[in-house]
């Protein structure tokens, strides 16, 4: 393991399409995975309106973009599926939109998670 | 090293059923998911079904469903698919795959296959 | 079910050659998009995860950039273990489907 980074060993877990995949719909995932692979949480979801759905969350593979971010935060502006990973047990249970723009003072919309999503 | 070897295929008549089974080593089987993919002679890649980590959850193809059942014992690290009701379309080779979550199906280790040939 | 669109279908390069392969997703799937190598006769191999992420083992002149339904594999100088077909994966939703594959041949 590298010193001075979190080690992800679980993370929230929500699938929308549970019925579908025949999945639960919320619970805790365990991340399993390669000794020599990071781990990390994410969350995907969707901006309807205005209103947040939430696609999926869980365990997410060794990947870059992940690497010491102790916070769930996607910065692409305005995509259609918004996606944030992060590192760090349960680091997905909460996540957040800061697009980077070139202005001075970038827009924030933090997502507080919100029944029927969490328990 | 992770090894995956599937067995299990060859000719069957249509209507009738095969069972083929996949092989694992090298790595801690029940900790990852586990798929079924295959490939009809000259085409492309089609996912077949997939199964979770402990078994409880299953997936399949609208092409298969209803008539491929995909199970997995956990104890033996091995991966299985029973196929009924064969169609020639069926014909392909079928390879198992590793996968670490069901939300990031990343195929990261794969057998070397197994030809299922359906024919009268 | 998400469809999955590759092109070209096949592409006549050198050794040395900057390839590009593009895949399209039929909606946005985030960054659920994965590559993989395959030769003739034998199993494919995972080239690129999560759209960006090299797999391990894959030499470094590899890479996979996009995000939503646009997505692009290349390969910055073609070398003779290359020649193979490339596939493209989402993983966004079930069934999990295929590109229909691009051969990248020796000119």
């Known amino acids: 393991a590298i010193l001075g980074r979190s080690e992800t060993q679980e993370c929230l877990f929500f699938n929308a399409n549970w019925e579908k995949d025949r999945t639960n719909q919320t619970g805790v995932e365990p991340c399993y995975g390669d000794k020599d692979k990071r781990r990390h949480c994410f969350a995907t979801w969707k901006n309807i309106s205005g209103s947040i759905e939430i696609v999926k969350q869980g365990c997410w593979l060794d990947d870059i973009n992940c690497y010491d971010r102790t916070d769930c935060v996607e910065k692409k502006d305005s995509p259609e599926v918004y996606f944030c990973c992060c590192e760090g047990n349960m680091c997905n249970e909460k996540f957040s939109y800061f697009p980077e723009m070139e202005v001075t003072q970038p827009t924030s919309n933090p997502v507080t998670p919100k029944p029927p999503y969490y328990n | 090293e992770v090894q995956l070897l599937e067995s299990g295929g060859g000719l069957v008549q249509p209507g009738g059923s095969l069972r083929l089974s996949c092989a694992a080593s090298?790595?801690?089987?029940?900790?990852?998911?586990m798929n079924w993919v295959r490939q009809a002679p000259g085409k492309g890649l089609e996912w077949v079904s997939g199964?979770?980590?402990?078994?409880?959850?299953?997936s399949y193809a609208d092409s298969v469903k209803g008539r491929f059942t995909i199970s997995r014992d956990n104890s033996k690290n091995t991966l299985y698919l029973q196929m009924n009701s064969l169609r020639a379309e069926d014909t392909a080779v079928y390879y198992c795959?590793?996968?670490?979550?069901?939300?990031?199906?990343?195929?990261?280790?794969w057998g070397q296959g197994t030809l299922v040939t359906v024919s009268s | 079910d998400i469809q999955m669109t590759q092109s070209p279908s096949s592409l006549s390069a050198s050794v040395g050659d900057r390839v590009t392969i593009t895949c399209r997703a039929s909606?946005?799937?985030?960054?659920?998009l994965n590559w993989y190598q395959q030769k003739p006769g034998k199993a494919p191999k995972l080239v690129i995860y999560?759209?960006?992420s090299l797999a391990s083992g894959v030499p470094s002149r590899f890479s996979g950039s996009g995000s939503g339904t646009d997505f692009t594999l290349t390969i910055s100088s073609l070398q003779p273990e290359d020649f193979a077909t490339y596939y493209c994966?989402?993983?966004?939703?079930?069934?999990?489907?295929f590109g229909g594959g691009t051969k990248v041949e020796i000119k």
């Open positions: 994966q989402q993983s966004y939703d079930n069934p999990l489907t």
């Open positions: 090298g790595f801690t089987f029940s900790d990852y998911g």
């Open positions: 909606q946005s799937i985030s960054r659920y």
């Open positions: 999560a759209a960006t």
């Open positions: 199964i979770n980590y402990n078994g409880g959850y299953t």
């Open positions: 795959a590793r996968a670490a979550n069901w939300h990031d199906t990343a195929l990261d280790y």
